[in-house]
């Protein structure tokens, strides 16, 4: 099982939408796949996929989850709020037939406020 996550860095405006993608691949077929999105280490959602469908479509505040065969799990945040800023990680585990798990690399989401003046200090603190 392998998990590739993207993008590494995502910067969006407050009120717009953010899309995080997790590509889950396995050489052999699977019957049930448990997936999990975390933000700053806290679980946003932990549904499973079976018969081509997600057991849950909601993932955290304003988060919508979708599965597109053969391998794309998408988390869409809409509308994005300042609280959505953070480090997101996608994790997956084949539960049936055999337990195997993997996780992606971090996606760092930065949300810019509608009023750019609110953001002046934070932008100045970004590494060059």
């Amino acid at each position: 099982l392998s998990v590739q996550q993207g993008p590494n860095l995502l910067q969006v405006r407050q009120g717009s939408q953010a899309t995080l993608v997790c590509q889950v691949d396995q050489a052999t077929a699977w019957e049930r796949l448990r997936v999990k999105w975390t933000k700053d280490g806290a679980i946003l959602c932990q549904p499973y996929i079976t018969n081509g469908s997600l057991s849950l479509g909601v993932c955290g505040p304003q988060g919508r989850l979708s599965w597109q065969a053969p391998s794309h799990l998408t988390l869409q945040l809409d509308p994005v709020s300042l609280n959505h800023s953070g480090a997101y990680v996608c994790w997956a585990a084949v539960e049936i037939p055999e337990l195997e798990e993997a996780e992606g690399n971090i996606t760092r989401l930065f949300v810019d406020p509608d009023d750019p003046t609110q953001n002046r200090n934070r932008i100045a603190s970004f590494p060059g």
């Epitope: 099982l1 392998s2 590509q23 396995q26 050489a27 052999t28 077929a29 019957e31 391998s71």
Partner: antibody
Framework: QVQLQESGPGLVKPSQTLSLTCTVS??????????WSWIRQHPGKGLEWIGY???????YYNPSLKSRVTISVDTSKNQFSLKLSSVTAADTAVYYC????????????WGQGTMVTVSS | DIVMTQSPLSLPVTPGEPASISCRSS????????????LDWYLQKPGQSPQLLIY???NRASGVPDRFSGSGSGTDFTLKISRVEAEDVGVYYC?????????FGDGTKLEIK
Amino acid sequence: QVQLQESGPGLVKPSQTLSLTCTVSGFSISTSGYYWSWIRQHPGKGLEWIGYINYGGGTYYNPSLKSRVTISVDTSKNQFSLKLSSVTAADTAVYYCATMADRFAFFDVWGQGTMVTVSS
Amino acid sequence: DIVMTQSPLSLPVTPGEPASISCRSSQSLFSSNTNRNYLDWYLQKPGQSPQLLIYHASNRASGVPDRFSGSGSGTDFTLKISRVEAEDVGVYYCQHHYETPLTFGDGTKLEIK
């Protein structure tokens, strides 16, 4: 470009352990998402999957051989190995190493094969 | 284990003529989770290692001539060669990777008439 090369003794005595090594060049064997496999072909016959080891060290073996097979990886040498114990004449075959990936689930690169004869 | 059954076992073909090989699996190789059939086709030319022709039942591998095509779903699959050439001789194998153990068909030997 990935290349695989099998090596090991061409003759093994019955009841002994067959040991083969596959050297991987042009690619890191520890790359996530890849499987390193052994497949054999008895003389004039079809192909038989022996087993594979994945990037995390997980092994999957053909149940028909499971009690006698060990596949391992040596990342420092970029090699993976096959050990088949208690061999008999029925283990005489051409042994191939091959690789496949989670994302592209097929054997796209094969070694040239090495003939192993079990005989006293 | 999933049993792969190929037919015919021998296939004499005249150059320029089409050829068709059938492969049947003892259980479905289609996954509704991924919308994929876990079935590949390989050609083993005389004295060589097998080479990939078709993956996931119908996708031609890189560098494979377009005269080769794969079709089918579930348990019944077909490899077709639209116009056989002399270089196509060898043994054709279907193989599943739906689950472990991975298994191959017995092979179809294509020879030129």
